[in-house]
Structure formats: C-alpha cells, structure tokens
Amino acid sequence: EGAAQPNNSLMLQTSKENHALASSSLCMDEKQITQNYSKVLAEVNTSWPVKMATNAVLCCPPIALRNLIIITWEIILRGQPSCTKAYKKETNETKETNCTDERITWVSRPDQNSDLQIRTVAITHDGYYRCIMVTPDGNFHRGYHLQVLVTPEVTLFQNRNRTAVCKAVAGKPAAHISWIPEGDCATKQEYWSNGTVTVKSTCHWEVHNVSTVTCHVSHLTGNKSLYIELLPVPGAKKSAKLY
C-alpha cells in the first residue's frame, strides 16, 4: 500500500521487503549525487508522514562520500535527550550519544552509505531527524519532521432510533468523519497518551425517507466508507457494511 504523499513535491518510494513491511524513502538516486555544492547549500527541511509498522530510510544531502569529513545524524524525539550518531571518515570512527532505540541504525557501514533507517516505525519515532555532512566547503544539512501515521479502526453502528455512531479509533493524526446524507451530527475527539486520537461522530436523521447512511472516514493513511441501513425499531442494532 502506498504511503501518503508528503507536503513537498518529492514522491515517496514504497516497496515490499522480504518481511512484508513497506519501506519508505525520500532518498535521491545515486546518479543525482552532485559535485556542485551550491545546489544543496540551503538547509532543507521536509515534513514526512510515515505509516506505523513500515520501514523508513532517511537520507543525507546528495554529496559524494569521498568529499566527506564527518556525517552526523541528530535525532530529537519527544521527551528524550537529543541522540547523535556520528561517523568520522578520517579515523573510520563511529560515535553515539544518548541513543537508546535499537531500531534506528545506519543503513549499512557509514563509510559506504550515510542513510539512516528506522526499522518497524513506532509512534515513539515521531520527531525531528537531521543529517549534517561536514565537507571542506562547509556543512550541509537535511532535516526531516517525521510524522508517524496510525490507521484508525473504523466502526459504524446504530444505537437508537434513526441514530448512527461512526468511530475512528486510535488514529494519528485525527481522522475526519463525514456523512452521506448529512444529518444532525455531534463529533467528539478523545486524545490518548500515545498521541493517537479517537473520533466519534453521532448522527440523527429525522427525515423518514432516509433509509441508508454512509460514514466516510478520511485519513492520511487512506479513506474508508461504511454504510448502514437505519431501522425504525427502537433499540435495534445493525452492523455496518463495508464497500
């Protein structure tokens, strides 16, 4: 399944790996590595939504490894001290400071590949990741505001006469719920400590010629629609149909 497109114009590359986890990357093709530093002088920051439980690969500016002196990844996660992973080419020395998450690693040996990978992205990986490449011509940066996306669990049921409840449970960010046809609706959001949000929309249809209603849940991870037939019998429950 394709991950959402980020805010900037770069498209996410998504593929299936042996262990069936999708892998997302914003990395440039090897052929695009530039010798012209002026093209990448500006610090680039990218907002990047990544689905939970996928693998993510984050890349440094496109500078040839032979021109490098040091590569540093700075990782700032909520509620944790800043983690630094550094590689000094001259001494072939790697160094880590305050890095405890074993799922965040170099893709391979940093002298061969400066990319950072997050294996099985979790909610706790929400944060800011920055690669700093030290070259004789200065330092070049690329930063990622990584937003971990969690697909909500969607349910739809009728709980009393001509009233339906649609819930998008534990999504990140909050899902948006809309109805066809529109009814008399009240929406409530419940925030969980892990950063997910449950959205509950309760709708009532007074008009008796409305027999089937559809709940449409919009989310960055994908959209889902469920419909239900409204029963006039008080207290009757009807399970939703997915289409």
């Epitope: 002196i69 040091i70 000094k88 001259e90 001494t91 030290v134 200065g138 330092n139």
Partner: antibody, heavy 124, light 107 residues
C-alpha cells in the same frame, strides 16, 4: 612534547612560487593527527589554509585550493606548503600547527600545538 | 564561510581586574569555538575549546561561555602574563575561521 618549526625563503617576488617546511619533533606525523598551515596577515587577521592528515589526505580552504598544496616527507617527519602565483597580499607570518584529535570529540579542529611562525614577504 | 566577529579590538585593563571578550559567529556553530592566546616570542596557546572546556594547563581564571552564535571569554583577576592578543576560532565547519583578534594591554 610535540614541537613544530617552520622554515622558508623570507622574501619572494610577485608571481613566483614559494615552499615552506614544517619540521615536527616529538611525534611521528604518520602516527596520527592532522597537520595544518595557518597564516597571519599584517593587522592580525588569521586564515586557515588547509591540512594534511596522518594518512596523507589533504583538505584545503576553498579560497586557496587552486594555487596551493600541502605535501609531506615521511622519512624526514616534515610537511610542506607550496603556494603559487604569489602577490603582495600573500605577505604574512605562516604557522604550522597540529589539530587536537581526541577519540571522544568529533568536531575537534582546534590547534593545540603551533610553530613559532615564519615571516614571508612578497615584494619586488 | 562562517564569519567571526570579535570585539573589542583593543582592551586596556589593570592587573587584578576582570575582562570579557566577545566573539560572534555568522551562523550557528553550536559550542564549537576555541580561544587562543598569542604573545610575542611564544607559540600560540589554545586556552579553551568547545565553547567552555579548559585546555589542559589553562589557569582557572579563564572561562568560556556561549552557544550558537554568541560567545564570551572572561578572564577574572588579571595576572601580568595575561596581557596578550586573544583570538577566537570556530571549529564547527570547514573552512575554519578566526576572529580578528583582541589586544589586551596594561592600563
């Protein structure tokens, strides 16, 4: 204790080239560290020129890259600066110096040992 | 290149006084700044690196502070041997760059 000593021509004519030598005692330059050239212009402005590391790799200041080079003679424990197409603006005191290079700190490009400096005047 | 602006250029003080020298970087250099002392007839000496770390052999009356772009070298209770030229140098990125120097003279 590590000691560095610069030597050179003193006076050079414009458009010519010159070479400076840095002799290192108390440490073998192939064993470690980075070995730099720095110059101080009249008026005290300082400019880092470049370095050669223990393995012979060089990193140069981009503003000078096209007309100078740093080399070494490992048998004599010396490293050299060659500056081409000199002008009066190259008149300066030239220093050789060694980077600190701790294993725990990566941005360690400060100079813990310096030579006394050698004056080079470019004049016709 | 990272522009380093040092001030003042000249500073006159008496032994026993305290003085401060400022160094401003043209961009964020984190804490990667060194301070040097230059005296005629002596080799240049690094006093402080990484913004505030005293180099081995530096007297404790010297201290460094700052982060990002603004840094200060403070000398408390000046000794006669402290009168010299002081330079700052950023060691965050290449090319390495120096401040223009501060000459500390006896008043």
């Amino acid at each position: 204790e590590i000691q560095l000593q610069e030597s050179g021509p003193g006076l050079v004519k414009p458009s010519q080239s010159f070479s400076l030598t840095c002799s290192v005692t108390g440490y073998t330059i192939t064993s470690g560290y980075d070995w730099s050239w720095i110059r101080k212009f009249p008026g005290n402005r300082m400019e880092w020129m470049g370095y050669i590391n223990y393995s012979g790799s060089t990193v140069y200041n981009p503003s000078l890259r096209s007309r100078f080079s740093i080399t070494r003679d490992t048998s004599k424990n010396q490293f050299f600066l060659q500056l081409n197409s000199v002008a009066s603006e190259d008149t300066a005191t030239y220093y050789c110096a060694k980077f600190e290079a701790s294993n725990t700190y990566l941005y360690d490009w400060y100079f813990d040992f310096w030579g006394p400096g050698t004056m080079v005047t470019v004049s016709s | 290149d990272v522009q380093m602006t040092q001030s003042p250029s000249y500073l006159a003080a008496s032994p026993g006084e305290s003085v401060s020298i400022s160094c401003k970087a043209g961009k964020n250099i984190n804490t990667n700044l060194a301070w040097y002392q230059a005296k005629p007839g002596k080799t240049n000496k690094v006093l402080i690196h990484s913004g505030s770390t005293l180099q081995s052999g530096t007297p404790s009356r010297f201290s460094g502070s700052g982060f990002g772009t603004d840094f200060t070298l403070t000398i408390r209770s000046l000794e006669p041997e402290d009168f010299a030229v002081y330079y700052c140098q950023q060691h965050n990125e290449f090319p390495l760059t120096f401040g223009s120097g501060t000459k500390l003279e006896i008043k």
